[in-house]
């Protein structure tokens, strides 16, 4: 995930309890990774700015048949005000940059941990 133009508040940011559970699920994915996550599937990178939860979901929802990220997809759907379906693309996607799901998850996790530490959740 790339952050263009510096840090922006990703509002409305999830309640801290929900953000904590998303972080824990991403930790679980990264720790339990033995084979390549989602068979090495590639997803669009996103900007970590306002609206990033929907953008992250729009990117990950295009990965099908990967049970490891299903819970993450469900959690992200609770952080996005609109219905997201495969093939949707947000302006937050870095459309010329694709990365592996494993890297996407790691980058998202690092950013969410930063948000959580800084108390930017409500």
């Amino acid at each position: 995930l790339t952050c263009l133009g510096g840090f922006a508040s990703p509002g409305p940011v999830p309640p801290s309890t929900a953000l904590r559970e998303l972080i824990e699920e991403l930790v679980n994915i990264t720790q339990n990774q033995k084979a390549p996550l989602c068979n090495g599937s590639m997803v669009w990178s996103i900007n970590l700015t306002a609206g990033m939860y929907c953008a992250a979901l729009e990117s990950l929802i295009n990965v099908s048949g990967c049970s490891a990220i299903e819970k993450t997809q469900r959690m992200l759907s609770g952080f996005c005000p609109h219905k997201v379906s495969a093939g949707q693309f947000s302006s937050l996607h870095v459309r010329d940059t694709k990365i592996e799901v494993a890297q996407f998850v790691k980058d998202l996790l690092l950013h969410l941990k930063k948000l959580f530490r800084e108390g930017q959740f409500n």
């Epitope: 309640p15 309890t17 929900a18 679980n28």
Partner: antibody
Framework: QIQLQQSGAELARPGASVKLSCKAS????????ISWVKQRDGQGLEWIGE????????DYNEKFKGKATLTADKSSSTAYMELRSLTSEDSAVYFC??????????????WGQGTTLTVSS | DIMMSQSPSSLAVSVGEKVSMTCKSS????????????LAWYQQKPGQSPKMLIY???TRETGVPDRFTGSGSGTDFTLTISSVMAEDLAVYYC?????????FGDGTKLEVK
């Protein structure tokens, strides 16, 4: 079904430490957080903190930092809370609960039967 | 910390009566992205553990009788029992799970005449 079995009543001296346990069954222990809640003499409920057993990550109520330490043993599906430097103010019933606030599909919160701690000289 | 204020602190009603109790939070518990209120209601009978009745402010837990109804949004919430039964004798607590520390109201004690 989901069950949380807490350890029996404890009697402790002021200044001592005590470790309460909460054994989970009926679900995957590492999938959900465990919260601890204090209730004094039939009074209100006070959230102490929570632990995520898979990672060991914890979140505490500032009021209980330095008083309570939460741990979890994945192999036995048991969560623990150690209370130290006990005073009469720590005499209470302590509950554990297993929870998730995952949206939009899930919410649950299952409670243990409580452990009564009495601190007395 | 989010403060949770419940009223009344106690009330006595006859079997069959309708009763309502309120809970006010010091800040909004509504998350605009999913339009969910991070509020639950618990029932604690004498000598027992708390039992969740309602979550997301208005969703009834499985197995909870439909005489229990949760309503409200933002900072103002209500638990209504449409027709009180003797077994409803308990203390009722509201709980916010929006942010840390999670907090509870002081409870409303329901006594059955």
């Amino acid at each position: 079904q989901i069950q949380l079995q807490q350890s029996g009543a404890e009697l402790a001296r002021p200044g001592a430490s005590v470790k309460l346990s909460c054994k989970a069954s009926g679900y995957t222990f590492t999938s959900y957080g465990i919260s601890w809640v204090k209730q004094r003499d039939g009074q209100g409920l006070e959230w102490i903190g929570e632990i995520y057993p898979r990672s060991g990550n914890t979140d505490y109520n500032e009021k209980f930092k330095g008083k309570a330490t939460l741990t979890a043993d994945k192999s036995s599906s048991t969560a623990y809370m150690e209370l130290r430097s006990l005073t009469s103010e720590d005499s209470a019933v302590y509950f554990c609960s297993s929870f998730t606030t995952l949206v939009p599909t899930d919410y649950f919160d299952y409670w243990g039967q409580g452990t009564t701690l009495t601190v007395s000289s | 910390d989010i403060m949770m204020s419940q009223s009344p602190s106690s009330l006595a009603v006859s079997v069959g009566e309708k009763v309502s109790m309120t809970c006010k939070s010091s800040q909004s518990l509504l998350y605009s992205s999913n339009q969910k209120n991070y509020l639950a209601w618990y029932q604690q009978k004498p000598g027992q553990s708390p039992k969740m009745l309602i979550y997301w402010a208005s969703t009834r837990e499985t197995g909870v009788p439909d005489r229990f109804t949760g309503s409200g949004s933002g900072t103002d919430f209500t638990l209504t029992i449409s027709s009180v039964m003797a077994e409803d004798l308990a203390v009722y607590y509201c709980h916010q799970y929006f942010t840390y520390p999670r907090t509870f109201g002081d409870g409303t004690k329901l006594e059955v005449k």
